[in-house]
C-alpha cells in the first residue's frame, strides 16, 4: 500500500506526482475539494497569561477603589445626595463583579473547571453588574435632568423612593440576567476544554439569540437612549443659562457616563454583530467569525476594566471624594486635621442648592 503524507500542506501538494490519468472516476482534482477546508480560530495575539495579569490588576484596583468609594459615601451621611446613593449602588455592583474576576482569570487558562453552580453564580454577577450599572446611570441622568432642566427638588429627594428605585434596579437587573441563571451550565465535550455557556438542548442557538436580543434591547439600548435624551437637554440648559457652578458639578457624572460608554459600547456593538451573524441576518464566514471572536476578546477586556475605573474618576475629577477620603483619614488619625481643605464638606457627591442638587 502506498504511503502518503498526513501533514500535506495543500491539496495540490497532496496530489502532486500522482498519475491522475489512471484515476478511477475523475481525471482532475475536483475544485470543491478546496472547500473541504478547516476554519481555524485565529486567537487574539494576546497571551492568555497577559489577560490573567490584567484581570488580577483590575481585581485589586476594583477591590480597593470601590471599597473606598462605599466607605466615603457611607461616612458622609449628613449631606448625602440622591446621586450619592446611586453611585454607592454602582460601587457595590462593581465590587461584587470584581470578586468573580479570579475565577474568570483561572478559566482563561484551564477552561471552566468550577462546575455548574459557580458557572451560574459568577455569570449572574457579571450580567447583574452590567445591567445595574447602566440602569443606575440612566437614573442619575433622569435625576440630573429633573434637577437642572426642570429645576425641581425631585421626587427622588424622598429617601424611601430612592431606596425603592435602587431595589427596583437590582430586581430588574436580576430579571434581565435570569436567562444566564437558568440556562448556563458547564458543558463538557470529549475534544475541547469544559466551558461555561448557555445550553438549551437542540434549540440552543435559537434560544441563545433570543435571550441575548431581549436583554441587549431593554438592558442596554433603552437606558442608553434615556441617558442621551436627559444629558442632551441637561447640557443644553447648562450652556444656555451659563450655569458655571452646575456645569462644573456635572463633570464627574459626564466622565462616569463617558467611561461607561467607552468600555461597554464596543463590546455591545460587537455582540450585536455576533447576534446578527448567528441569526443569519449577516452571512457567517470563517473570516468574519474570526474577526468577531477576536473583537469580542478585546472588547471584553475593556468591559472588565470598567469595574475599576469609576473610583479613579472620582479620585482625579471629584473634588468632594478626595475631601471625603481625607476626612475619614483625619478622623482615624492617619493624617493631620490641618491638612484638610478649608471647604471640605461631608457630602461625597454634592449638596442641594435651592431646588436643584448639584453633583460633584
Amino acid at each position: 500500500m502506498e504511503d502518503f503524507n498526513m501533514e500535506s500542506d495543500s491539496f495540490e501538494d497532496f496530489w502532486k506526482g500522482e498519475d491522475l490519468s489512471n484515476y478511477s472516476y475523475s481525471s482532475t482534482l475536483p475544485p470543491f475539494l478546496l472547500d473541504a477546508a478547516p476554519c481555524e480560530p485565529e486567537s487574539l495575539e494576546i497571551n492568555k497569561y497577559f489577560v490573567v495579569i490584567i484581570y488580577a490588576l483590575v481585581f485589586l484596583l476594583s477591590l480597593l477603589g470601590n471599597s473606598l468609594v462605599m466607605l466615603v459615601i457611607l461616612y458622609s451621611r449628613v449631606g448625602r445626595s440622591v446621586t450619592d446613593v446611586y453611585l454607592l449602588n454602582l460601587a457595590l455592583a462593581d465590587l461584587l463583579f470584581a470578586l468573580t474576576l479570579p475565577i474568570w482569570a483561572a478559566s482563561k487558562v484551564n477552561g471552566w473547571i468550577f462546575g455548574t453552580f459557580l458557572c451560574k453564580v459568577v455569570s449572574l454577577l457579571k450580567e447583574v453588574n452590567f445591567y445595574s450599572g447602566i440602569l443606575l446611570l440612566a437614573c442619575i441622568s433622569v435625576d440630573r435632568y429633573l434637577a437642572i432642566v426642570h429645576a425641581t427638588r425631585t421626587l427622588t429627594q424622598k429617601r424611601y423612593l430612592v431606596k425603592f428605585i435602587c431595589l427596583s434596579i437590582w430586581g430588574l437587573s436580576l430579571l434581565l440576567a435570569l436567562p444566564v441563571l437558568l440556562f448556563r451550565r458547564t458543558v463538557y465535550s470529549s475534544n475541547v476544554s469544559p466551558a461555561c455557556y448557555e445550553d438549551m438542548g437542540n434549540n440552543t442557538a435559537n434560544w441563545r439569540m433570543l435571550l441575548r436580543i431581549l436583554p441587549q434591547s431593554f438592558g442596554f439600548i433603552v437606558p442608553l437612549l434615556i441617558m442621551l435624551f436627559c444629558y442632551g437637554f441637561t447640557l443644553r440648559t447648562l450652556f444656555k443659562a451659563h450655569m458655571g457652578q452646575k456645569h462644573r458639578a456635572m463633570r464627574v457624572i459626564f466622565a462616569v457616563v463617558l467611561i461607561f460608554l467607552l468600555c461597554w459600547l464596543p463590546y455591545n456593538l460587537v455582540l450585536l454583530a455576533d447576534t446578527l451573524m448567528r441569526t443569519q441576518v449577516i452571512q457567517e464566514t470563517c473570516e468574519r467569525r474570526n474577526h468577531i471572536d477576536r473583537a469580542l476578546d478585546a472588547t471584553e477586556i475593556l468591559g472588565i476594566l470598567h469595574s475599576c475605573l469609576n473610583p479613579l474618576i472620582y479620585a482625579f475629577i471629584g473634588q468632594k471624594f478626595r475631601h471625603g477620603l481625607l476626612k475619614i483619614l483625619a478622623i482615624h488619625g492617619l493624617i493631620s486635621k490641618d491638612s484638610l481643605p478649608k471647604d471640605s464638606r461631608p457630602s461625597f457627591v454634592g449638596s442641594s442648592s435651592g431646588h436643584t442638587s448639584t453633583t460633584l
Epitope: 495543500s10 473541504a36 477546508a37 478547516p38 476554519c39
Partner: nanobody, 111 residues
C-alpha cells in the same frame, strides 16, 4: 492545533452497513468543510465524499446513493454512513480537512 480522530471501522458482510465518525478539535467546526478519503491496498487514494464549508455535499460516482456524509455541530463530529457495502469498498478510510488528516480506520467488506 487541529486534530481529527476517526472511529467506527470494522469487518462487515457485503450488503451490510457501517457508520464512520470523525471527531474534530481545534477548529470552528460549523464553518469547516471536510472530506472522506479511502485507500485500498495497491490502489491510489481517492476522495469518497465531501462536505464543503457552505454545507454542499458531493459524492464520488461509485458511492452515490449508498454513502451519506453528515455533521453534528454540537458534538464537533462528522459522519459517513455507508450502506449496501461492497467488497470493493474495503480500504482504510481517512477524514480530512485542509492539511489535516485523521489516523484512518480500516473497513473490510467480506463477500
Amino acid at each position: 492545533e487541529v486534530q481529527l480522530v476517526e472511529s467506527g471501522g470494522g469487518l462487515v458482510q457485503a450488503g451490510g452497513s457501517l457508520s464512520l465518525s470523525c471527531a474534530a478539535s481545534g477548529l470552528i467546526f460549523r464553518l469547516s468543510g471536510m472530506a472522506w478519503y479511502r485507500q485500498a491496498p495497491g490502489r491510489q487514494r481517492e476522495w469518497v465524499a465531501v462536505l464543503t464549508k457552505d454545507g454542499t455535499l458531493h459524492y464520488a460516482d461509485p458511492v452515490k446513493g449508498r454513502f451519506t456524509i453528515s455533521r453534528n455541530n454540537a458534538e464537533n463530529t462528522w459522519y459517513l454512513q455507508m450502506n449496501s457495502l461492497k467488497p470493493e469498498d474495503t480500504a482504510i478510510y481517512y477524514c480530512n480537512t485542509g492539511r489535516y488528516w485523521g489516523q484512518g480506520t480500516q473497513v473490510t467488506v467480506s463477500s
